[in-house]
Interface confidence: low
């Protein structure tokens, strides 16, 4: 199911505005013109190619008429050369033969970039898309007819003086070549010199194929069909009664109008050749909405066709195509997933009237900033009992700034770094504390989007406990009894408890043990001591807490 | 033929969890998106989470983002629902649904599982 | 968040009769919208897609028009097995259904 889409290789920092979402095609847009891409603000070409796949030839007989085709063309369409059906003619199949995605499947699809350069937009991440809007206000959709395989139509040879550049049923020839019909059946390109005959065809004969261009003026809403013949013909509709065509134009069909045309020419016999003509809907009923949920817009592409107002043409006539890389699917949507962020893709998206191109865009669309990578190399240290130190490399990928966390269980802080810091001093941390650290880079895009962390860690010095807590002296005759709580700050790893006592500035006792439960025997009755009760942590002693008690007098005198 | 069939609805107490399954066959399923709706007991329906056909997009309502997680295994066409720190208004009929992404419409659904919550 | 107000809530009609449902939006969500039906005990079933689209299956008689904030469902001559509830649903913004309108026999 692999399938390689062709980006353009490039990352853009300013794509035109194109319709998406809730945009309309535009009013001044006229969809089957050439694409004007000298006003683009961007570095890159837009082209409207056919399809790949597109095996999309009808054969109509000259007796059944109803299958006239409307084509894309996407170069200035004027005479077009009629059609020679050859024997591959025949076995050329009608759309549906391309894959199907199911309905409402998403194309898991492989797409492969080519590399892209190291410009980094510093324009928070916007999903960029260009698609090719032609902006003429008149422009061709050519519709062609052609005759069934075992006509035996004497086609008159025809010059065409353009190059359309779709890729349908119809020979486009450039200027100064010539077709004629081989025996075989198999189209021959001569030199403009041919012999005549003398015996006039038939009209039904001379006007088998003729190639019809649908002009649309998005002014008035309405087509003109232009019939692609050297002679100015007469065109008569079913009343038989006037000629309704001006230099071979039909003029001021609504969208949807389906009617037969009687065209005739003295230089024919039979009277006439009936030619249906079918007008398909105005260009900007369909509108192609960018469906791509934000959070998935970094590795995903999702393409919609929607109608935005209704018509009366027949929908059963209305196809859609995508084209991303080389797979086609036949669907109003796609969904493409596992893409590469921050790169340009191509898609291009048909619609097809009655079999044939309608409208053709092609898509650029740039997905989003990807997620950022690791910070890399990343070592972190205590500096003494109150400050350490992170270092890190930046990621590969593009980021806009990092977060820096550290955790000492349970507290949290965590700091938005700018993104050209390599390092980072933290300060005020508290002493002999394990300090978690977790670094990680993010982008703001159309979401967030936060990098892998980072992390590492380390344990700041010791530092002079706080003074112990809560210290009760409970007094006798002779003795003293000391309690005391666990300072709030123990800032080492884990020592004894002290307690120093004095008569005067003599030291009487000098007492150590892991619990602050101390019994001070044999003192002098009725005495003023002083008590100092300290933590000492293993490296340093905190601040003493002195309190001064005497001992009781004497109770058995 | 297409179908869904949910599992895993049971009577749990305020605060509880159940975790509730949606086994599919009859299509591809990691070629769709996929939709939980529920409906209280005389009420209407209510979206409840839908998730991508990867599983990299996934949408839930206010009233039960935090509290329910939405998941699938491709591998084993199965859709899950965790529902943690259940409440009483979490009471209803629980569906399945296949989203057909292009329409938005989910034009294939179980026969539901009844979830009740209550001390 | 969209939200969807049905009317009417409730609605009494006889077969043969034509029916009109109308969904409103809080804000515009073009053509986002599909129709449900509900019989009791029974899971939705799908009857209208992007506003106006039938899906397969479905009789020609419910048809569905509307956009941007205001759609219709419409039941061109109503049949015994029409009588149910009926929801609409948005999808252009998260996912919000309509409450509801019982459709029930005068």
């Known amino acids: 199911q692999g399938s390689t889409l062709s980006p353009t290789g490039r990352r853009t920092t300013k794509m035109p505005s194109v319709p998406l979402s809730s945009d309309p095609l535009p009013t001044h847009t006229t969809a089957f013109s050439p694409a004007s891409i000298s006003e683009r603000e961007n570095d890159f070409s837009e082209t409207t190619p056919s399809l790949s796949s597109d095996n999309t030839s009808t054969q109509v007989s000259p007796d059944s008429l109803d299958n006239a085709s409307a084509f894309n063309t996407t170069g200035v369409s004027s005479a077009l050369t009629p059609h020679l059906p050859t024997h591959a003619d025949s076995q050329t199949p009608s759309t549906g033969t391309d894959t199907q995605t199911p309905s409402g499947s998403a194309a898991n699809t492989t797409l492969s970039p080519t590399p892209r350069s190291n410009d980094i937009s510093d324009v928070p991440g916007e999903r960029s898309t260009a698609s090719t809007f032609p902006t003429d206000p008149i422009s061709p959709l050519a519709t062609t007819l052609i005759p069934a395989r075992n006509s035996s139509a004497a086609l008159p040879a025809r010059t065409s003086n353009t190059t359309i550049t779709a890729n349908t049923s119809v020979s486009y020839l450039n200027a100064s070549e010539t077709t004629t019909p081989s025996p075989s059946g198999s189209t021959v390109i001569s030199t403009p010199t041919i012999a005549t005959t003398t015996s006039k065809p038939t009209c039904a004969e001379k006007y088998a194929t003729i190639p019809v261009d649908y002009l649309y003026n998005n002014k008035t809403k309405l087509f003109t069909a232009k019939l692609n013949v050297n002679e100015n013909v007469e065109c008569t509709n079913n009343n038989h009664t006037h000629n309704i065509c001006t230099n071979n134009e039909v003029l001021n069909l609504p969208e949807c109008k389906e009617m037969n045309v009687f065209v005739s020419h003295n230089s024919c016999t039979d009277r006439h050749k009936e030619l249906k003509l079918d007008v398909p809907p105005e260009v900007e009923k369909f509108q192609l909405d960018d469906c791509t949920p934000d959070v998935e817009a970094n590795t995903t592409i999702c393409l919609k066709w929607k109608i935005i107002e209704t018509f009366a043409c027949d929908k059963s006539k209305i196809t859609y195509r995508f084209q991303c890389g080389n797979k086609t699917y036949n669907k109003e949507g796609i969904y493409l997933e596992n893409l590469e962020p921050e790169y340009e893709y191509k898609c291009d998206s048909e619609i097809l009237y009655n079999n044939h191109k309608y409208i053709n865009i092609t898509k650029l669309i740039k997905t989003d900033f990807g997620i950022p990578g690791q910070p890399q190399n990343v070592v972190c240290r205590h500096e003494d009992a109150h400050q350490g130190v992170i270092t890190w490399n930046p990621p590969q990928r593009s980021f806009h700034n990092f977060t820096l966390c550290y955790v000492n269980k349970p507290a949290k802080k965590c700091l938005i770094l700018d993104k050209h810091l390599t390092t980072y001093h933290l300060q005020n941390l508290k002493p002999y504390t394990n300090y978690s650290l977790s670094l990680h880079a993010y982008i703001i895009a159309k979401v967030q989007r936060n990098g892998t962390a980072a992390t590492c860690n380390f344990t700041t010095e010791s530092a002079p406990p706080s003074q112990v807590q809560n210290m009760i002296v409970s007094t006798s005759d002779n003795s003293m009894h000391v309690k005391c709580e666990v300072p709030r700050d123990v800032n080492g790893p884990t020592g004894l408890y002290h307690l120093e006592v004095e008569a005067g500035n003599t030291l009487v006792r000098n007492l150590s043990q892991s619990k602050c439960d101390f019994s001070v025997n044999n003192l002098q009755y009725s005495t003023y001591y002083n008590l100092k009760a300290y933590y000492h942590n293993g490296k340093y002693s905190g601040e003493p807490v002195i309190l001064r008690e005497s001992t009781s007098y004497n109770s058995k005198a | 033929e297409v179908q869904l069939l949910e599992s895993g609805g049971g009577l749990v107490q305020p605060g509880g969890s159940l975790r509730l399954s949606c086994a599919a066959s009859?299509?591809?399923?990691?070629?769709?998106?996929m939709t939980w709706v529920r409906q209280a007991p005389g009420k209407g329906l209510e979206w409840v989470s839908s998730i991508s056909s990867s599983g990299g997009s996934i949408y839930y309502p206010d009233r039960v983002k935090g509290r329910f997680t939405i998941s699938r295994d491709n591998s084993k066409n199965t859709l899950y629902l965790q529902m943690n720190s259940l409440r009483a208004e979490d009471t209803a009929v629980y569906y399945c649904?296949?989203?057909?992404?292009?329409?938005?419409?989910?034009?294939?659904w179980g026969q539901g599982t009844t979830v009740t919550v209550s001390s | 968040d969209i939200q969807m107000t049905q009317s009417p809530s409730s609605l009494s009609a006889s077969v043969g009769d034509r029916v009109t449902i109308t969904c409103k939006a809080s804000q515009n969500i073009n053509k986002n919208l599909d129709w449900y039906q509900q019989k009791p005990g029974k899971a939705p079933k799908l009857l209208i897609y992007?506003?106006?689209n039938l899906q397969t299956g479905v009789p020609s008689r419910f048809s569905g028009s509307g956009s941007g904030t205001d759609f219709t469902l419409t039941i061109s001559s109503l049949q015994p097995e029409d009588f149910a509830t009926y929801y609409c649903y948005q999808h252009n913004s998260r996912f919000t259904f309509g409450q509801g309108t019982k459709l029930e026999i005068k």
């Open positions: 992007e506003t106006n």
């Open positions: 649904a296949r989203d057909e992404r292009w329409a938005g419409a989910m034009d294939a």
């Open positions: 009859g299509f591809t399923f990691n070629n769709y998106w």
